[in-house]
Each structure stands twice: as structure tokens, then as C-alpha cells.
Interface confidence: medium
Amino acid sequence: GITQSPKYLFRKEGQNVTLSCEQNLNHDAMYWYRQDPGQGLRLIYYSQIVNDFQKGDIAEGYSVSREKKESFPLTVTSAQKNPTAFYLCASSSRSSYEQYFGPGTRLTVTEDLKNVFPPKVAVFEPSEAEISHTQKATLVCLATGFYPDHVELSWWVNGKEVHSGVSTDPQPLKEQPALNDSRYCLSSRLRVSATFWQNPRNHFRCQVQFYGLSENDEWTQDRAKPVTQIVSAEAWGRADCGFTSESYQQGVLSA
Amino acid sequence: QLLEQSPQFLSIQEGENLTVYCNSSSVFSSLQWYRQEPGEGPVLLVTVVTGGEVKKLKRLTFQFGDARKDSSLHITAAQPGDTGLYLCAGAGSQGNLIFGKGTKLSVKPNIQNPDPAVYQLRDSKSSDKSVCLFTDFDSQTNVSQSKDSDVYITDKTVLDMRSMDFKSNSAVAWSNKSDFACANAFNNSIIPEDTFFPSPESSCDVKLVEKSFETDTNLNFQNLS
């Protein structure tokens, strides 16, 4: 397949940054595209064979090299006026126009590294009203105050990641929409049966992987360096009054 | 060589049929359709080469115009999983692809028994913090942003409890303002009256209840998945 690394990349303005793209499909041709929010794909550069690359529609501020068939690194130079975007790499065989894409790299460039903040994460417990009204329980996870918006949120129950019953906002929300480098927030819901929530042995954890500064990035602020890190919040199930292990087991067996 | 895609946005109900279009003034030797989910790379769905060609892929039907200047994608009985950006691309003279801007498709789920409600949830660590959850509303209901910049309201998202074959819509609102209340958090959205359900005051010794539990967590996990 095609791999792009890293998935998220963060840089200070004025620095060159290189995005990697590797393919093991034995394809001669490789392509770099830029995609801005809500937009289609715009071709930056493409290469039909080793040592061979051509400018696309928006090559200014970018450079590429193609020493190997498998690799087509893209350098976003300091001359690029608006580098923050989603970058996609693709490859194809010379005989076909069918392109196969990598997973993409999200690049964010900021004026100042002091704008970088990791998220604060909180888990909110289900409302008793929801439990009595629907026999279901929704936990809400809130990640707030982070910049850039390079986060991945996941739910873990009793130590295992879960996907069923989960819904996460498709995009983080700007906390101050008018600001360029506004911090962001993101919410997610996990819904389980009331009986499952009401077992105090069940452990619920919301995990947010934040992609921030690397060890090499300079940091002069007096707060902790906002490096790439995992931030979590948790909750334990809560038994309802008059709820016994027998009635719980009954709930499990009938579910 | 430009490719025009229409419509730019399309929002339909689960189970409905739809057609999206891709047109150009130029002739293309071949044409591709891709589907892209947010934050992911596009995935190739099909390539059409011959004018007048029709290709079927389960519920998706692709057609290439006789003059090789246009193409259509028809989806039968759309599913929420069909949601995404549909991109068409034509073979350029340079061995590169010319991409259209895409059609953003949103397939709204059928909510079986909508039961709209707003609930207040408390932070598991500090009881003075809370969020408001608007849930179980039908897919026709739109959630509006707050006019107050200090109140945050998320877009609605769909949640699928696969083990219970149950889908629901929900949105979340919160604020640091002292006068923020769940009862009117979603007032800008057109929602039914009396949807706010305040939590009853709980008055029992949870410690006593917890003592009686000796449950197998693996069994619990099976119940969840």
C-alpha cells in the first residue's frame, strides 16, 4: 500500500518541513495533492518515473525529489504562503490512470509555538433522567483548550477500545472562531445499556491522543512543554439504589 | 480541462435513491470515481473507459456518457455508511488526473422511535461542571449554533449501538457561564417543548450497593460489544 508519515505535523512559520510518502506497489508514477477544508484535490507535483517530476497546478512554495521508485518526499518550503492543509500522496502504474491514495498528512503551521496547548479532558456521567426514561446511559467526553486540532479520541471500556455506541464530532470546534490560532474543543458520546452503566465494576475511559511539539522543538515558556501526549479521563459505573447483583445479572442475561 | 460536479452538497434520508453528476467540456480517455471520508485518503470505487459504459457495484451504478465527457453515479437505497465526499477524476494528457471539487453526501439515519430529550450530565471528577446532551431526536431536526460566543454547541452526530440495533442522533452543549442552563441550551434549534428532563435527586448509599457486586468483567464486555 501507500504510507504517509507523520499523520499530523506541526511547524513554526518560516521553517521548511518534509512530508514522507512511500509505496510498495511497484508503481512508477507518484503524486502529491493538497486539500483544503471542504475542497477538492489540487495537484502540487507529480513524478512519472524516478528522477522525473513535474509541477502541478500549485507547485509554488513546494519542492520534491524522486531518487527511488518507492519514495516521493514533499518539502513545504518557507516560501509557501499558506501551508496549513491536508496533504495527500497517491501512486499509479504507468499503464493506468487509477490512483491509490495514502492516508494523508495534516500540516498546521503557526506564527508562534506558544500557541500550542494540550487538551484538558473530562468525562461526564449519564443523567439519572436518561437512565430512567430510556434504560440507556450516555457518557460524554469533552476535550477542550487544545491547539493545534491534531487529536484522536477513543473510548476504552474495561481496558479494551470500543467502537460500537460511540459517536465523536467529525471536526473540533474553534473556541474563538475569530482567532487564527484559536484553541479547539471536541466532544464524544458513548452510549451503553443502563444495566451496563450501573455495574460499578465497569470502567470507562476517554483517551485523547494529542499531536503537539516534538522533543526537538524549542520551548522557552514557563509552562510544561506541550509535546505529543495522551490525555485521559475516566469514570466508574454507578449502582442505582435498590439495584442488586442478582437483578444486574438478570439484566446481563436478558440483554 | 475542468470537471464540474453537481450537486456540491446533498443530504438525504436513509433508504432514498440519489444521483450525482460529473461533466466536462473535454473528452476523457477514462474516468474514475473516488469516495473520501473526513481525514482519510480517497478510495477508488470504479474506472470507466468506454463511452456509454455502465458499471454496477452492489448499490452503486456508474455511467460514462457516450461522448466520454460526462459521468453519473447512482446510489440505490442509500445507507449512513455512504456518507462522504464523492470525487470524479478524468485522465489528463500528462498521465495525471484532473479532479472535480466533489459532491459531499450526507445520509441521515432513520430513527425508529424518536424521543427527543435534553439531559444534564455531571463531570465524574467535579460536580460543579456539567454538559447538556440533546439526544434521540429525528434526523429532520437541525441543531443550531448558539448566538452566544461563550456557549458551545456541537453539530449533531449519529451513534449506532450495534448490539441493540439502535441508532440515535445527539448533540452536546456546554458553557463556563454561571447562568447557563440545559433547559434553554438548545433554544435556537427548533425542538419540541418540554424536552428537558432534570435528573432526580439521588439519596442512597452507593457504597452499600457496590459491596454486593462480584461480576465477571468479561461477561460485562460481551454485553457491550
Epitope: S47, Q48, I49, V50, N51, D52, Q54, K55, R66, E67, K68, K69 | G92, S93, Q94, G95
Partner: antibody, heavy 116, light 107 residues
């Protein structure tokens, strides 16, 4: 800076094999790029003959496919041209070059005359 | 194979003049054409890649244009060191092929 230098006999008899060496300095031939042989006939016409890639695979001009072989010795950072059953039509200046689509780096060339 | 036809075979100009070299491909090659200069007893030197893209170290008086089948290399003010042979080269399809060249001579 990468440099390429061709070497080999300047005179070859018809029906014999032509063997040339290209010595590369300033870049490892296994690190990347395609390593080509291109020849220029007496009337100045240029002909691409073939290449060996950094990973050792080949691509040849179909007009020479039955007679040509391009190999390499990675320990010496050299690649080689072998052309069988030569005729007087193979008299030319032979260049080794680094390239893929376009060819930015050429050797100085070596002239080979095919004559009895 | 794709044929590359260069015309004329000879061009005579004086220093300071503008000159254009023509190259025609036997089929549509988009912009997959490159231009080389070869001085007497020298190796070819890459001047322009992909019809119009400049090469670092090459004087800015050299420029290229065209797409599809018809291409032009221009020197906007010829200098004495520019009297040489000029070749076009397509990399659209294998085998990659060269034009027969145009000789730029001093008038």
C-alpha cells in the same frame, strides 16, 4: 557532486561483444535513480539504450532487446553495458547518464568504433 | 516509438539576436519534453525540463514553451557560448526518444 566516467575498448570487431564500464563517484548507485546508457551516432543522432535501476531491475530499448544487457557491481559503484553481435552500425559515442524521464547528469562519453 | 522532428537543421544568427528552435512530436506528449545543449566535443547538458521548467545553473535567457505536439526552445539574446547543437527529448512513453538536433551557427 555526482560524476560519471565511461571506460572500455575503443575498437571492437564485428560480431563480437562491446563491453563498457561506467564508474560513478559522489553517489551510491544503490541509493536511488536510474542509471542509463545512451549513444550518439556519427551523424549526431541520440539513442537511449536502456537503464539499470538502483534496485537492480532493467529496462531496455525494444530495438536492442535481444543484444543488450546492463549489469552492475555495487561494491565498486559501477554499472556495465554489454552489447552482443555488433556491426559497423554500432559505431558511436557511448554515454552513461543518470536519469529517469529527463537526463540531468551525463558522463563525458567514450567513442567505440566497430571495424575489422 | 514517438518520433521527434526538429526544424530547421541549421540556424544562423548574430550575437544579441533572439532565436527559437522548433520540435514536433508524432503524437500528443503533453509537456513531457526536455531540451539539451551540446557544444563541440562535449556531453549534452540539460537546459529545460517539461517544456518550460527552468534548470538551476542555466542562464535565464533560455526558455521553453508548448504542449501537446508543438514545442519551442528560445534564447532571448544569443551569446557567443550558445553556438552549439540543441536536441529535444520526449519522456512521455518508452522508449524515450530524441530529435535529430538543430545546429546554431554564427552568421
Amino acid at each position: 557532486e555526482v560524476q560519471l566516467q565511461e571506460s572500455g575498448p575503443g575498437l571492437v570487431k564485428p560480431s563480437q561483444s562491446l563491453s563498457l564500464t561506467c564508474s560513478v563517484t559522489g553517489y551510491s548507485i544503490t541509493s536511488g535513480y536510474y542509471w542509463n546508457w545512451i549513444r550518439q551516432f556519427l551523424g549526431n543522432k541520440l539513442e537511449w539504450m536502456g537503464y539499470i535501476t538502483y534496485d537492480g531491475s532493467n529496462n531496455y530499448n525494444p530495438s536492442l532487446k535481444d543484444r543488450i544487457s546492463i549489469t552492475r557491481d555495487t561494491s565498486k559503484n559501477q554499472f556495465f553495458l554489454n552489447l552482443n553481435s555488433v556491426t559497423t552500425d554500432d559505431t558511436a559515442t557511448y554515454y552513461c547518464a543518470r536519469g529517469g524521464g529527463y537526463v540531468p547528469v551525463w558522463g563525458t562519453g567514450t567513442t567505440v568504433t566497430v571495424s575489422s | 516509438d514517438i518520433q521527434m522532428t526538429q526544424s530547421p537543421a541549421f540556424l544562423s544568427v548574430s550575437p544579441g539576436e533572439r532565436v527559437s528552435f522548433s520540435c514536433r512530436a508524432s503524437q500528443n506528449i503533453g509537456t513531457s519534453i526536455h531540451w539539451y545543449q551540446q557544444r563541440t566535443n562535449g556531453s549534452p547538458r540539460l537546459l529545460i525540463k517539461y517544456a518550460s521548467e527552468s534548470i538551476s545553473g542555466i542562464p535565464s535567457r533560455f526558455s521553453g514553451s508548448g504542449s501537446g505536439t508543438d514545442f519551442t526552445l528560445s534564447i532571448n539574446s544569443v551569446e557567443s557560448e550558445d553556438f552549439a547543437d540543441y536536441y529535444c527529448h520526449q519522456s512521455h512513453n518508452w522508449p524515450t526518444t530524441f530529435g535529430a538536433g538543430t545546429k546554431l551557427e554564427l552568421k
